[in-house]
């Protein structure tokens, strides 16, 4: 027993960023005189945020009217809560002293714990683009939630996916934390519709958790496959040749012919077909005046993607007085590097 | 039940020190201040001091330079010390339980005479 | 310090009539929404007995003949009815400011 006792009933509180946190205390006895004030924290160090005596402090309200007589219930609420608030305050009486105040009594401190939401998932992918068959990393970020507690789950086009690595800091007390992951997903050529998804679940989202998806259309690169024919005679010395681009991804893709190693003609892919997996068709094709060759001609379709080294195909026009429909059975030719060292 | 006691010499000369003891039980002097309180015969009350809970004291700016109030917690006891004693401070001497001043000792009879 | 004036100095007063005892303070003795003044009744050979508290709170088992009013600088003890062994000397006081200070002190005669 005390002759003041300063009462503190809630031991923890927890409040949702943004909202309003009430801290409650009341006073055994208005005796000794003496204002009361909140602090956060204990010590020298400790924050002042509400003096009954003097000052100005605008985020606080106090529960009761301090002016209405004999009023014990020194109780504050402080407003819009931020992670930034969270710690244990202490309501503590004052008794007037020669020359200053003299602290009294504390009462036993209230713990603010505040419930701040993590932030919108973000996703990144790999800087440069990736073929088939290759792992490439994303990672997800999202920042200032409290509590400490969180969980992060990855899915590439609703399959959850196991091979991710993930990372809450700061590792010890934090007025908010920040979660990282990061996933690694194999690429298919059928992932230019794919996406992958961070899911992410904590205590203030209610069970609807957050995503952050990144499309695997900004990722992958899925190299086209050649194939030159011979078309049947459009008119006399005339040969149609087509090259047929197929399975490419992403667009931007420049076609060369060449005529027995010279440029002949150069174009870029304009109107293409797309398939139901995303990639594009396109076809191109050479007019080749027969009668302007003694000797057999060598018809190379040389393809530029995405800014990849060229690759490239060839076909064998051979020249006689009645051509005919030839298919091409010559293997491809690489005039540039290897088509797989692309990153 | 709340009980405070004063003690002490009856008869102090002047010039000397008066030294009062106050025996409480019922409460905790950790957790109550103490005051003393004086009333010359016929006269009436004058507050000498208090000493809190935590030992801090406060005086009567009028008799700060001769009072002294201290306490031994485990004893149970609050004392008072007043220096340069002349008639003036004869009078009936009472300690009294905290700021409130909601219980009181009988009081003791202190006589200042050669 | 804080002068406290009681006023009268004395009255006689006939059981079950109302007495009535004023405390002037020279400044106000009002801190935090309350008034640090208080009563008190003394007989002699004894040690005062706490009255009223925070200007109008009665102390627990004071009767409730005892009542206590005021703000600021202005109070008044009431005692309606009266009783013969009201007959006593009362005293306010304040602890607001340091030092603490008494009236001088009204004394209660019963008729």
């Known amino acids: 027993e005390e002759e003041l006792q300063v009462i503190q009933p809630d031991k923890s509180v927890l409040v949702a960023a943004g909202e309003t946190a009430t801290l409650r205390c009341t006073a055994t006895s208005l005796i000794p005189v003496g204002p009361i004030q909140w602090f956060r924290g204990a010590g020298p160090g400790r924050e002042l945020i509400y003096n009954q005596k003097e000052g100005h402090f605008p985020r606080v309200t106090t529960v009761s009217d301090l002016t209405k007589r004999n009023n014990m219930d020194f109780s504050i609420r402080i407003g819009n809560i931020t992670p930034a608030d969270a710690g244990t305050y202490y309501c503590v009486k004052f008794r007037k002293g020669s020359p200053d105040d003299v602290e009294f009594k504390s009462g036993a401190g209230t713990e603010l714990s505040v419930r701040a939401k993590p932030s919108a998932p973000v996703v990144s992918g790999p800087a440069a683009r990736a073929t088939p068959q290759h792992t490439v990393s994303f990672t997800c970020e999202s920042h200032g939630f409290s509590p400490r507690d969180i969980t992060l789950k990855w899915f590439k086009n609703g399959n959850e996916l196991s091979d991710f690595q993930t990372n809450v800091d700061p590792v010890g007390e934090s007025v908010s934390y920040s979660i990282h992951s990061t996933a690694k997903v194999v690429l298919t050529r059928e992932d230019v519709h794919s996406q992958v998804i961070c899911e992410v679940a904590h205590v203030t989202l209610q069970g609807d958790p957050l995503r952050g998806t990144a499309n695997l259309s900004e990722t992958i690169r899925v190299p086209p496959t050649l194939e030159v024919t011979q078309q049947p005679v459009r008119a006399e010395n005339q040969v149609n040749v087509t090259c047929q681009v197929r399975k490419f991804y992403p667009q931007r893709l420049q076609l060369t012919w060449l005529e027995n190693g010279n440029v002949s003609r150069t174009e870029t892919a304009s109107t293409v077909t797309e398939n139901k997996d995303g990639t594009y068709n396109w076809m191109s094709w050479l007019l080749v005046n027969v009668s302007a060759h003694r000797d057999d001609v060598k018809l190379t379709c040389q393809v530029e993607h995405d800014g990849q080294p060229a690759v490239s195909k060839s076909h064998d026009l051979k020249v006689s007085a009645h051509p005919k429909e030839q298919g091409s059975n010559t293997a491809a030719e690489n005039t540039g590097s290897n088509e797989r060292n692309i990153y | 039940q709340v009980q405070l006691q004063e003690s002490g010499p009856g008869l102090v000369k002047p010039s000397q020190t008066l030294s009062l003891t106050c025996t409480v039980s019922?409460?905790?002097?950790?957790?109550?201040?103490v005051n003393w309180i004086r009333q010359p015969p016929g006269k009436g009350l004058e507050w000498i001091g208090i000493i809190w809970g935590d030992a801090s004291t406060d005086y009567n700016s009028a008799l700060k330079s001769r009072v002294t109030i201290s306490k031994d917690t485990s004893k149970n006891q609050v004392f008072l010390k007043l220096s340069s004693v002349t008639a003036a401070d004869t009078a009936v001497y009472y300690c009294?339980?905290?700021?409130?001043?909601?219980?009181w000792g009988q009081g003791t009879t202190v006589t200042v005479s050669s | 310090d804080i002068v406290l004036t009681q006023s009268p100095a004395s009255l006689a007063v006939s059981p079950g009539q109302r007495a009535t005892i004023t405390c002037r303070a020279s400044?106000?003795?009002?801190?935090?929404?309350?008034?640090?003044m208080h009563w008190y009744q003394q007989k002699p050979g004894q040690p005062p007995k706490p009255l009223i508290y925070?200007?109008?709170n009665l102390e627990s088992g004071v009767p409730a003949r005892f009542s206590g009013s005021g703000s600021g600088t202005d109070f008044t003890l009431t005692i309606n009815p009266v009783e013969a062994n009201d007959a006593a000397n009362y005293y306010c006081?304040?602890?607001?400011?340091?030092?603490?200070?008494f009236g001088g002190g009204t004394k209660v005669e019963i008729k």
């Open positions: 019922g409460f905790s002097l950790t957790g109550y201040g």
């Open positions: 006081q304040q602890n607001n400011e340091y030092p603490w200070t």
């Open positions: 400044e106000s003795v009002d801190s935090y929404g309350s008034s640090f």
């Open positions: 009294a339980r905290a700021g409130k001043m909601d219980y």
């Open positions: 925070l200007a109008s």
